[in-house]
């Protein structure tokens, strides 16, 4: 018996087609992805093959103005239209709190939404009961297939699930649910979830009875043969893990942003054992036409987005200096504003010993692309912020050793004075540079804001200590020459859309007046620029 698994993960609000790098589509003939194009391909496969499941491994939420405006209603609507068979909860599904998950998505989805390792307690238990499930048995042709869901147990640090959801260890939570499926005589079981490729492989190895793992969170691109676009494969598709009980378990993921549709064919014997598995992600490029009816629906929903982007979010009573003449040479108040917003977006009081789990932010000055003039009645709109942050990136959470941070700050000024983008803006960090010293030895003071304290204060950076830092995904991926971050990071979790983070902060504050306040200093009285 043959099953075709179609899968997406980490789509992050890319409902419309995008450019090759998953930013805004400019030249339509070169654009990729989007739900209209995805639907064309899915329908083509459904018509051609008998037993097809379309699965999503989480993080549909967060990433473009679509989510900012529609808050998840767009996810339910278009996933229903595409007839997804099941979805696992990702960490970003909790970005607007539990209510922001329940009302727009859990109550509106016409398909099962799954997670076996999230347990509700207190008053939430009855409110959310039945709205998501640990597993779902799906009828596929004359057979049944069990889908068991899982979600990153780091979600309380990455999003806003509140205090009434407990995120258990994935493997511990999955095993009894898989066992329960076995007692229901379900002998073909897919683990569908959002904990990253390393955990996907562990689940394949450790959870007895799981036949296939379909994952997300780490944006992992797997491919067999010559890859069709810019993504470099982390391994073959499917990635085969030998389980502790000796079975070959295929593990798949489909990069991110709806650029690819995962396509995996599994052959089962009559006892539900995997005989063979093969496939590859399908690049959703312009050779695949956009479905006209879905496209028309997208265009209808789009109208509200254009209206939103010109509405006032809040006001500034000071000039927001995002000029390259400032942000690439010295502390600029636009950099301070953005870093303050990044920290504010990551406030999670999950431990009494810590005022917050993260206090530091770094931001490449080259990522700040425009100032905002306060002499327009002080008005700040989404459109204004899109000019400041036009690349459609995210502000991510990483864990780094102090020594890596020191290298990053040395890199920040290694060729100072050439208006290059690597000059770092900061939050929760006080840095002093001495530009008279040779490159690689210019950081003379680096103090960081404590987290395990009731009164936050600045202490010298410790080289061997592990620190959490919020930074743009561009830096986490080694952009602007920050190879040491990419090479040495100990953990990397994708965060919220950059513009959304700043817009939410401005809306919350109502009136802003960021200052230049001595976060970045130069010793030896260097007056540059």
């Amino acid at each position: 018996w043959e099953l075709t698994i179609l899968h997406t993960n980490d789509v992050h609000s890319r409902l419309e087609q995008t450019s090759e790098d998953s930013s805004k589509c400019v030249n339509a003939s070169r654009c990729m992805g989007g739900v209209a194009r995805l639907f064309t391909k899915v329908q083509q496969i459904r018509r051609a093959e008998p037993n097809v499941l379309l699965l999503d491994a989480g993080d549909q939420y967060q990433g473009t103005i679509w989510f900012t405006v529609y808050k998840g209603a767009e996810v339910a609507h278009f996933m229903n239209a595409l007839r997804y068979d099941a979805m696992a909860l990702g960490n970003h599904e909790f970005d607007n709190g539990v209510e922001g998950l329940i009302e727009p998505l859990l109550k509106e989805a016409k398909f099962p939404i799954l997670s076996a390792n999230i347990k509700a307690k207190g008053p939430l238990a009855s409110q959310i009961s039945g709205l998501y499930l640990p597993y779902k048995v799906l009828p596929v042709g004359d057979e049944v297939v069990g889908i068991v869901g899982y979600t990153s147990k780091e979600t309380p640090f990455l999003s806003n699930p509140g205090t009434n959801l407990v995120f258990e260890d994935e493997i511990t939570a999955l095993q009894p649910e898989v066992d329960k499926l076995k007692t229901l005589n379900v002998n073909k079981i897919i683990a569908l979830g959002h904990s990253g490729f390393e955990m996907d492989k562990l689940i394949a190895q450790k959870v007895r009875g799981v036949d296939v793992v379909v994952g997300g969170h780490s944006n992992t691109f797997l491919y067999t043969g010559n890859p069709p676009s810019k993504e470099v494969p982390a391994g073959k598709y499917p990635f085969i893990v030998t389980s502790d009980d000796g079975r070959k378990v295929p593990v798949v993921q489909a990069y991110a942003f709806g650029k690819y549709l995962g396509y995996l064919k599994i052959e089962f014997d009559e006892r539900g054992n995997v005989i063979s598995s093969h496939g590859n992600p399908i690049l959703l490029n312009s050779s695949i036409p956009e479905d006209p009816s879905i496209k028309a629906d997208i265009n209808k929903w789009r109208i509200k987005l254009d209206n939103y982007s010109t509405q006032e979010l809040g006001k500034t009573i000071v000039y927001l200096d995002g000029s390259s003449q400032s942000c690439r040479f010295r502390e600029c108040n636009m950099g301070n504003l953005i870093c303050d917003a990044m920290i504010n977006n990551n406030l999670r009081h999950t431990d009494e010993m810590f005022w917050n789990h993260v206090s530091m932010c770094i931001l490449n000055g080259g990522g700040i692309r425009s100032p905002i003039d306060e002499r327009n009645n002080g008005t700040i709109t989404w459109e204004n912020l899109a000019a400041v942050l036009p690349f459609g990136g995210t502000f991510d959470l990483v864990q780094l050793k102090g020594s890596t941070l020191k290298k990053a700050f040395e890199h920040s000024v290694h060729r100072y004075g050439q208006s290059t983008g690597e000059f770092l803006q900061v939050g929760g960090i006080h840095v002093v540079y001495d530009l008279s010293r040779k490159p690689g030895d210019r950081v003379v003071k680096l103090d960081v804001l404590c987290t395990k304290c009731r009164v936050p204060s600045y202490d010298p950076l410790k080289m061997d200590e592990v620190y959490k830092v919020i930074l743009p995904n561009f830096l986490a991926n080694g952009g602007d020459g920050f190879q040491m971050i990419k090479d040495e990071l100990l953990r990397h979790d994708s965060g919220d859309q950059d513009i959304n983070v700043v817009s939410t902060y401005i809306s919350k504050m109502k009136v802003i007046y960021p200052a230049v306040e001595g976060r970045i200093k130069f010793s030896h009285h260097h007056h540059h620029h």
Epitope: R83, D85, K107, E108, A109, K110, F111, P112, S129, G130, L131, L133, K136, V137, L138, P139, V144, L184, N185, V186
Partner: nanobody, 124 residues
Framework: QVKLQESGGGLVHSGGSLRLSCAVS????????IGWFRQAPGKEREGVSC????????NYADSMKGRLTISRDNAKNTVYLQMNSLKPEDTAVYYC?????????????????WGQGTQVTVSS
């Protein structure tokens, strides 16, 4: 809390009719496919009928085709099963079940929520 409650069962003579109701609470009915099942003493539970979440698709067991009509009233959060020309072999406990999914199925395992059942007895 999700709850399904069957009613309308009872004792009926061969050739008679019954209308079973399945009242659901704790969720909006229009997102759920509802199935009717029956279990006679000493036998496996078997699918009788089903109506998809959109209401556009219905299924009937071969053994009862032409004698059943399934319908749903989303406003009342209730699904009905009209059973005509009943036979003694239709005697069983009738259950309704719900699953959040688009498609009908007669497979017991795919349904997530079940009612307690209502007894239907057809005398000759």
């Amino acid at each position: 809390q999700v709850k399904l409650q069957e009613s309308g069962g009872g004792l009926v003579h061969s050739g008679g009719s019954l209308r079973l109701s399945c009242a659901v609470s704790g969720f909006a009915l229009d997102y759920y496919t509802i199935g009717w099942f029956r279990q006679a003493p000493g036998k496996e539970r078997e699918g009788v009928s089903c109506i998809s979440s959109s209401g556009s698709s219905t299924n009937y067991a071969d053994s009862m085709k032409g004698r059943l009509t399934i319908s749903r009233d989303n406003a009342k959060n209730t699904v009905y099963l009209q059973m005509n020309s009943l036979k003694p072999e239709d005697t069983a406990v009738y259950y309704c079940a719900a699953q959040r999914y688009y498609y009908c199925s007669d497979k017991v395992a795919v349904y997530d929520y079940w009612g307690q059942g209502t007894q239907v007895t057809v005398s000759s």
